[in-house]
Amino acid sequence: IWELKKDVYVVELDWYPDAPGEMVVLTCDTPEEDGITWTLDQSSEVLGSGKTLTIQVKEFGDAGQYTCHKGGEVLSHSLLLLHKKEDGIWSTDILKDQKEPKNKTFLRCEAKNYSGRFTCWWLTTISTDLTFSVKSSRGSSDPQGVTCGAATLSAERVRGDNKEYEYSVECQEDSACPAAEESLPIEVMVDAVHKLKYENYTSSFFIRDIIKPDPPKNLQLKPLKNSRQVEVSWEYPDTWSTPHSYFSLTFCVQVQGKSKREKKDRVFTDKTSATVICRKNASISVRAQDRYYSSSWSEWASVPCS
């Protein structure tokens, strides 16, 4: 058993049918010695008396808020949550496996640049009685500080007969050095509590691996005289690291017809302009990627040809 926060405790339960459970001793936080009784949640049934209460925690029915009283007055509370291990595996019931980039991916994180700021998000089908707490550091043995805000509900969507909720959190490395080579990964730890269930989820990554630039901005077309060709120009996104001479991007320019089946013409360039043939009813799209490290491509920025 360990303390998650004041008066909230997590019992780690290795569960299987007929498991003996965990013996837990609760101590009433009071100088009083006599006349103390214990109850669980809203029940008035007295579970025991004395300054300590020994319970056998076998299942969620044994978890909840234990309260010690004296003469009708509440002395202290202890909320017991369960962290369940089954077949040697800690439960992962609260969050949805996003399955990308691989199975058992519960947390996904992205950074728009090398500033040390990143966003993580996760999915759940649970709508109520749910809390998250996020901690982060660079490295784990001698951790360097990363400050995370509160997790917030960022999107709701319907998937089949299921409603899915997306939560996200923003974190910032306290002493980020954008140009430095990373040797220790960022660690992100999410504590999730649903009703009386505790679970924890972790992710470990280098900022360079989670970079996803914003789409190029100011995408413009300039028709070339007496030609079907146009000059496409764009700019680095505002959120990208500076100076651009050091933090350079490469670009993919795509001409796409109205029909998805039409052949796509693609040009790759390190410049912020390109000359392409603009077909009728087509659109031109540009996306960006770090020039020197193959992390994610940005989303597309698009303009119609007409």
Partner: nanobody
């Protein structure tokens, strides 16, 4: 929200078998841990057993262990209670329940309940 409807109850003789079904509609059935409870007249609702969302693990009350089996078919949104070697003391209204906590024998850990189906075991 999940709606639960039990079926399969009836009158049987001691030693016989019966299979109860619980059909779920509404939000995704496979998200929920499912439980069976029963209530005899004048008594509190009693835990019978439960099954986890994947159907890979079950948990039973001592009074039914070895005689009752819970299973589920997530494709059919249905949970089953196979009862064998029935005894007169198994007579009760049987309720199906859906919740988020497995294992739990406590009724308040379940969020959704069916209306119940009567099982009577005569001697």
């Amino acid at each position: 929200e999940v709606q639960l409807v039990e079926s399969g109850g009836g009158v049987v003789r001691a030693g016989e078998s019966l299979r109860l079904s619980c059909a779920a509609s509404g939000r995704s059935f496979s998200n929920y841990e499912m439980g069976w409870f029963r209530q005899a007249p004048g008594t509190e609702r009693e835990f019978v057993g439960s099954i986890n969302r994947r159907g890979s693990s079950t948990y039973y009350a001592d009074s039914v262990k070895g005689r009752f089996t819970i299973s589920r078919d997530n494709a059919k949104n249905t949970v089953y209670l196979q009862m064998s070697s029935l005894k007169p003391e198994d007579t009760a209204v049987y309720y199906c329940a859906a919740g988020w906590l497995y294992p739990s024998s406590r009724s308040r850990d379940y969020d959704y309940w069916g209306q119940g189906t009567q099982v009577t075991v005569s001697s």
